[in-house]
Each structure stands twice: as structure tokens, then as C-alpha cells.
Interface confidence: low
């Protein structure tokens, strides 16, 4: 006597107050894999989600986040306020980067510039809210009879003041 | 080859609890099947009494339902009955048995169980 | 409930005869197209043994003598030609509706 719930293919499930018949999916469900009791209740793509894959009845609907949000989690289980480059999201809002910090994402929270001087580097580009510090060459790089290099212009952008 | 043993006391006394204990051999109980308990009364008229499914839901013959519970021991390969408030009419031999389609394929040889003060 | 009555209650064949065991039940028991009706031949000191399943699939092992027959609340265990083996008591149970219910059991004698 074979159990007949191991034949159940995805899409169906073992109803076992039928003596075990694959019985398919209801709808607004599914089953990903063969030989279950049960189908699962599709997830709905609600509020700040929105609908990225149908539920069919062999695989769950797949949900990203309307614009101006982005996901976070396991299968987008959560949708995150998206911010400006320079800020980070804190529980009152974006607020911009502190001083000596960056964000270059619409995402995570600021992080320190980088400190050259740990490699005994020296600054070639200044931070900004948006940008991280760029290290040049190593003073002793800069040394007579060490090959030349000179540092381009500290770059600018548009609209922001030095920090 | 899949083999059942069931065990427990041989007298129970009226308004105490029937504890019987099937063991499984050969074959995981979490694997697949339905995991049944019958008994026959004196006089060989069957009765089934509920089965525990692999995945651990529960079926039970609502004329026992206030009084019947099924469960199992994963760790053990074990599954279990309680029968609560016994009488002499629950005086039977108790069977546990594997099953699926309805229809049960491997059975425990049996234990008798006399209700009786 | 559904209520399967057998009959006969016990009946006497000879070795290489036909033994034909009748189980009606009180409603039918089936559900899209299959008869969930099942035969287990019993003997004594020994737990019921499963011959038939869903009207007429012959378990594994069983000889091929035993056969099922059957839809809706008429079903039939045939046994041909009977061996002397074959003496034991034969229970026919549904599956369809809760609760599962036995028949109250054929004893077949060898003559």
C-alpha cells in the first residue's frame, strides 16, 4: 500500500479527510513543492508593496516596494523609506549626514570618511555628505627622486559647498 | 520491514486512563502514512478509534472524541493513545496499525486490555 | 454512521471451490470515482491482515486468488479457488465517511 501523498505534485495537496487524494489548490493558494498536507495562503502585495510576481499555484506572489521605498528582509518582508544621497533614515526621518560622514545610497545609514592617515595616506578629494574622502599617494610618494604625480583639482559637485 | 508493538497495562480500572504505546520499526513515522488505533471488543466486532498523520494532525471517531487523544513521540518513532473515563465497555484488544487510502496494511499484534475494579 | 452489514455470517466451501463474501453499506462509498472499500481477512490470535483495498486492488503479497469487486454500497470479496489456508474470519471497512466502520465479519469454514 503505496502513500498516496508522496504523489501529490505541487499545485496540490494531500487532503487527507479524502482519503488522500490529491485535491489542487485552492484559489489564493499554492503548494512549491509535491507531497503536502497543506497549500500555503498566497501572500498579498498590500500598502507601500506592490505586486512584482503573481501567486500561481505552484509558487507564492513575490512582492518589491512602490517607489520612494526600497526592501529590506528575507523576500522583501519589509518595505524601508527611501532617503537622499547625504542622509540617513532615523526614527524622526531622513536627516542628513553629520559632519566626517557619508551615505552614497538612498539606503543604510552614514558611514566615516575614510582616515588616510592610518595607511599614511594623504587627502587627494575632500569628503562630503555624499562621498567618501579619497586617499592619494603616501608623502614619501611625493619625495625628490620619486616619480611625480599631481593630484587633480578636488572635485566639486554641483550645488554643495566644501564641508 | 516495517514492524508495530504495542504495550501498555493489561488492567485499568472503571473512570481511570488508558495509556497504550505503539513503537515503530523500519519505517519513520514522520515519513508519510496515517498512524492508526483500532480495537476489537469481545465478540470480534472492530472498531477504529483515530489515526495521528505523519504530520501530526489528528482524526478521531467522534463517538470517542470527548475522551480520546492521539499523540507521538518523533524522537521515538512512537505514537500514543490516551483513552480517558474508561468503562467496561472499553474492555478490547488494541491494535495500532499504519494506513493510508483508508485502508490500514501493517498492524501490531495486539494488546488485551480489561476494564475492570 | 454508515453501517456495513455481511453476510453470510459464516458459510462452509471445500478446497478449490468459489467462497463469495457479500458487504452492503447504508450509503454509498464513493467519492470521485473510486469505492473506498477495503477487505482484511483475520485469523484467530492474529491481527486483521489486509487483502483489498479501494474496492478491488489487491494488496502486495496477497494471492491472487482474492479478488475485489464493487461500487457504491454493493461489494463483493471472491476467493478462488479457496485453499485450506484460507479458513479465517473476513471483515470488509469503509473509508469514505468518518467515522471508518467495519462489517461484522464472514467466518469462512473449509470443508
Known amino acids: 500500500l503505496q502513500d498516496p501523498c508522496s504523489n501529490c505534485p505541487a499545485g496540490t495537496f494531500c487532503d487527507n479527510n479524502r482519503n488522500q487524494i490529491c485535491s489542487p489548490c485552492p484559489p489564493n493558494s499554492f503548494s512549491s513543492a509535491g507531497g503536502q498536507r497543506t497549500c500555503d495562503i498566497c501572500r498579498q502585495c498590500k500598502g507601500v508593496f506592490r505586486t512584482r510576481k503573481e501567486c500561481s499555484s505552484t509558487s507564492n506572489a513575490e512582492c518589491d516596494c512602490t517607489p520612494g521605498f526600497h526592501c529590506l528582509g528575507a523576500g522583501c518582508s519589509m518595505c524601508e523609506q527611501d532617503c537622499k544621497q547625504g542622509q540617513e533614515l532615523t526614527k524622526k526621518g531622513c536627516k542628513d549626514c553629520c559632519f566626517g560622514t557619508f551615505n552614497d545610497q538612498k539606503r543604510g545609514i552614514c558611514r566615516p570618511w575614510t582616515n588616510c592617515s592610518l595607511d599614511g595616506k594623504s587627502v587627494l578629494v575632500n569628503g562630503t555628505k555624499e562621498r567618501d574622502v579619497v586617499c592619494g599617494p603616501s608623502p614619501a610618494d611625493l619625495s625628490p627622486g620619486a616619480s611625480s604625480v599631481t593630484p587633480p583639482a578636488p572635485a566639486r559637485e554641483p550645488g554643495h559647498s566644501p564641508q | 520491514d516495517v514492524q508495530l508493538q504495542e504495550s501498555g497495562p493489561d488492567l485499568v480500572k472503571p473512570s481511570q486512563s488508558l495509556s497504550l504505546t505503539c513503537t515503530v520499526t523500519g519505517y519513520s513515522i514522520t515519513s508519510g502514512y496515517n498512524w492508526h488505533w483500532i480495537r476489537q471488543f469481545p465478540g470480534n466486532k472492530l472498531e477504529w478509534m483515530g489515526y495521528i498523520h505523519y504530520s501530526g494532525s489528528t482524526n478521531y471517531n467522534p463517538s470517542l472524541k470527548s475522551r480520546i487523544s492521539i499523540t507521538r513521540d518523533t524522537s521515538k518513532n512512537q505514537f500514543f493513545l490516551q483513552l480517558n473515563s474508561v468503562t467496561t465497555e472499553d474492555t478490547a484488544t488494541y491494535y495500532c496499525?499504519?494506513?493510508?487510502?483508508?485502508?490500514?496494511?501493517?498492524w501490531g499484534q495486539g494488546t488485551s486490555v480489561t476494564v475492570s475494579s | 454512521d454508515i453501517v456495513l452489514t455481511q453476510s453470510p455470517a459464516s458459510l462452509a466451501v471445500s478446497p478449490g471451490q468459489r467462497a463469495t463474501i457479500s458487504c452492503k453499506a447504508s450509503?454509498?462509498?464513493?467519492?470521485?470515482?473510486?469505492?473506498?472499500m477495503n477487505w482484511y481477512q483475520q485469523k484467530p490470535g492474529q491481527p486483521p491482515k489486509l487483502l483489498i483495498y479501494v474496492a478491488s486492488n489487491v494488496e502486495s503479497g496477497i494471492p491472487a486468488r482474492f479478488s475485489g469487486s464493487g461500487s457504491g454500497t454493493d461489494f463483493t470479496l471472491n476467493i478462488h479457488p479457496v485453499e485450506e489456508e484460507d479458513a479465517a474470519t473476513y471483515y470488509c471497512?469503509?473509508?469514505?465517511?468518518?467515522?471508518?466502520?467495519f462489517g461484522g465479519g464472514t467466518k469462512l469454514e473449509i470443508k
Open positions: 450509503q454509498s462509498v464513493d467519492y470521485d470515482g473510486d469505492s473506498y
Open positions: 496499525a499504519r494506513g493510508a487510502l483508508g485502508a490500514m496494511d501493517y
Open positions: 471497512q469503509q473509508s469514505n465517511e468518518d467515522p471508518w466502520t
